[in-house]
Interface confidence: low
């Protein structure tokens, strides 16, 4: 499972949809990120 | 304008220490995802830790190669991130990059610093 | 951790041709991959997000595909300052990771 901040604020928020832990808007932190980056 | 400027680096000694800064100015510092990157001369990219923004309650995450031995640190009120960097070693030497990413809905904020060089060396 | 592999390591080609580089992942990392480009003694920077959205000011020319583990950078025609190292990364667990980079030269 994904479990990067990005990831628990999108789950937190309900961004992510229920196949399979896609964010619906397609993002993706850049850090480096990371998010991040 | 929106800047990040990392200061700090320099030539240390194997098992030194050296505190990087990252001045943030032209966006909401504290609304922002933080991580530090560094590149040793002449390799790739290699992600050293993040801290989350104070929504996120500041939470952190680091590299395998840096637990323990490096803190990041934020502190919003001076738009500053912050690298304690402890026991150093040879293979830490590299330029440090700090890049700061916000998601406003539709789409990202990403900003990089220009870098700043630490070598580790006696 | 989650490794990234880019290829080729080197692509050689000639301004206005098409440039098709890859990014394979280890385990599945969804759509939590970036694109960056890197010139030599500048900060990275960002393309793409989220495997295929084309990041502030990015030109057209540039785009991103793929999910799961297989993720490609197109550049479908080369203009002379594209000429750089290209990174891949993935944010999806922890550490973040990146590519060891597709260096894109002149031919």
């Known amino acids: 499972a994904c479990d990067t901040a990005t990831c628990v604020t999108h789950r937190l928020a309900g961004l992510l949809s229920r196949s399979g832990g896609v964010v619906k808007n397609n993002f993706v932190p850049t850090n480096v990120g990371s998010k991040a980056f | 304008e929106v800047q990040l400027v990392e200061s700090g680096g320099g030539l240390v000694q194997p098992g030194g220490s050296l505190r990087l800064s990252c001045a943030a100015s032209g966006f909401t510092f504290s609304n922002y995802w933080i991580s530090w990157v560094r590149q040793a001369p002449g390799k790739g990219l290699e992600w050293v830790a993040e801290?989350?923004?104070?929504?996120?309650?500041?939470?952190?995450h680091y590299a395998e190669a840096v637990k323990g031995r490096f803190t990041i640190s934020r502190d919003n009120a001076k738009n500053s991130l912050y690298l304690q960097m402890n026991s150093l070693r040879a293979e830490d030497t590299a330029v440090y990059y700090c890049?700061?990413?916000?998601?406003?809905?539709?789409?990202?904020?990403?900003?990089w610093g220009q870098g700043t060089l630490v070598t580790v060396s006696s | 951790e989650i490794v990234l592999t880019q290829s080729p390591a080197t692509l050689s080609l000639s301004p206005g041709e098409r440039a098709t580089l890859s990014c394979k992942a280890s385990k599945r990392v969804t759509t939590y991959v970036s694109w960056y480009q890197q010139k030599p003694g500048q900060a990275p920077r960002l393309l793409i997000y989220g495997a295929s959205n084309r990041y502030l000011g990015i030109p057209a020319r540039f785009s991103g595909s793929g999910s799961g583990t297989d993720f490609t950078l197109t550049i479908s025609s080369l203009e002379p300052e594209d000429f750089a190292v290209y990174y891949c990364s993935q944010s999806y667990n922890y550490p973040y990771t990146f590519g060891q980079g597709t260096k894109l030269e002149i031919k």
């Open positions: 801290i989350r923004s104070e929504s996120d309650a500041s939470a952190t």
């Open positions: 890049t700061g990413y916000f998601d406003y809905g539709l789409a990202i904020q990403n900003y």
